[in-house]
Amino acid sequence: APTSSSTKKTQLQLEHLLLDLQMILNGINNYKNPKLTRMLTFKFYMPKKATELKHLQCLEEELKPLEEVLNLAQSKNFHLRPRDLISNINVIVLELKGSETTFMCEYADETATIVEFLNRWITFCQSIISTLT
């Protein structure tokens, strides 16, 4: 059974992930971002279901494509280089989802824009955090 210390650690990691995803979204939605229209043309893939930490596998698999799109507006909109930002997220995701079980992600048929993709994972983090508190 999860201990209060492990729950607290999970909660902190989720909050960190949430902040990182929100920072990316804010950087993209920044009114000074001239690349937004172009960035919205890139397709991202969403999980059919995202209710448990193991479903973060679906986020992990889309992190590299996310980094490529962020590279297009790297210097003006983010405090960190996309490579470092995605690397930080990857570390948190790996810790949160665990490596004990190999989960095969199932994706929804319809694609999403980068904004929809980020909003989906922000909602996921908020939802899991709310169950822990």
Partner: antibody, heavy 121, light 113 residues
Framework: QVQLVQSGAEVKKPGSSVKVSCKAS????????IHWVRQAPGQGLEWMGW????????NYAQKFQGRVTLTADTSTSTAYMELSSLRSEDTAVYYC??????????????WGQGTLVTVSS | DIVMTQSPDSLAVSLGERATINCKSS????????????LAWYQQKPGQPPKLLIY???TGQSGVPDRFSGSGSGTDFTLTISSLQAEDVAVYYC?????????FGAGTKVEIK
Amino acid sequence: QVQLVQSGAEVKKPGSSVKVSCKASGYSITDYLIHWVRQAPGQGLEWMGWIDPEDGETNYAQKFQGRVTLTADTSTSTAYMELSSLRSEDTAVYYCARSLDYDPIYPFAYWGQGTLVTVSS
Amino acid sequence: DIVMTQSPDSLAVSLGERATINCKSSQSLLRNGNQKNYLAWYQQKPGQPPKLLIYYASTGQSGVPDRFSGSGSGTDFTLTISSLQAEDVAVYYCQQHYITPPTFGAGTKVEIK
């Protein structure tokens, strides 16, 4: 049709810089990234970086960071690659290339004819 | 960076025969979301820039003869020339177009036997 025309061959001394140009025609230069790839004599292909001519945003391969500068002049539809602190190992054919799509890592469908840069004392 | 390993280094094939080139990546090039493999093949003749033949592992570039085909998934890929023609003598390169930096194999030289 899409065309990328590069400047002529250069012979440079070690320690100096070289600036290669790539003039785009047949499309709007601001619609696609321009990549630079080099090929040493008898060797394989090595990606150096890309520039988005629309806003000058760049992304360089780590190996060339600090030594390569990519720029673009939208008024003349020309992209430039400047490589500094040249050494003999930089002797290569330098290509500019454009992909089929705006995607940063889409494969390169259009290539310049190449510019041979020879570094020799 | 993803390392691309091609084999063989060179290949001599009789006219009209099949030529097969292999390419292995150090990590998977399959994006699970769209089930696409981000691998391209190029042909380069002496004194010319590379020419894109295939991308997404098996999608032929417009205007490329259909004797050129690509296959494979994950980390193992193959370029096949079904019936070698004299004009196919060249060096062939694979390239991953999955993540920055895009990286190339060392090349395979195809000659007439």
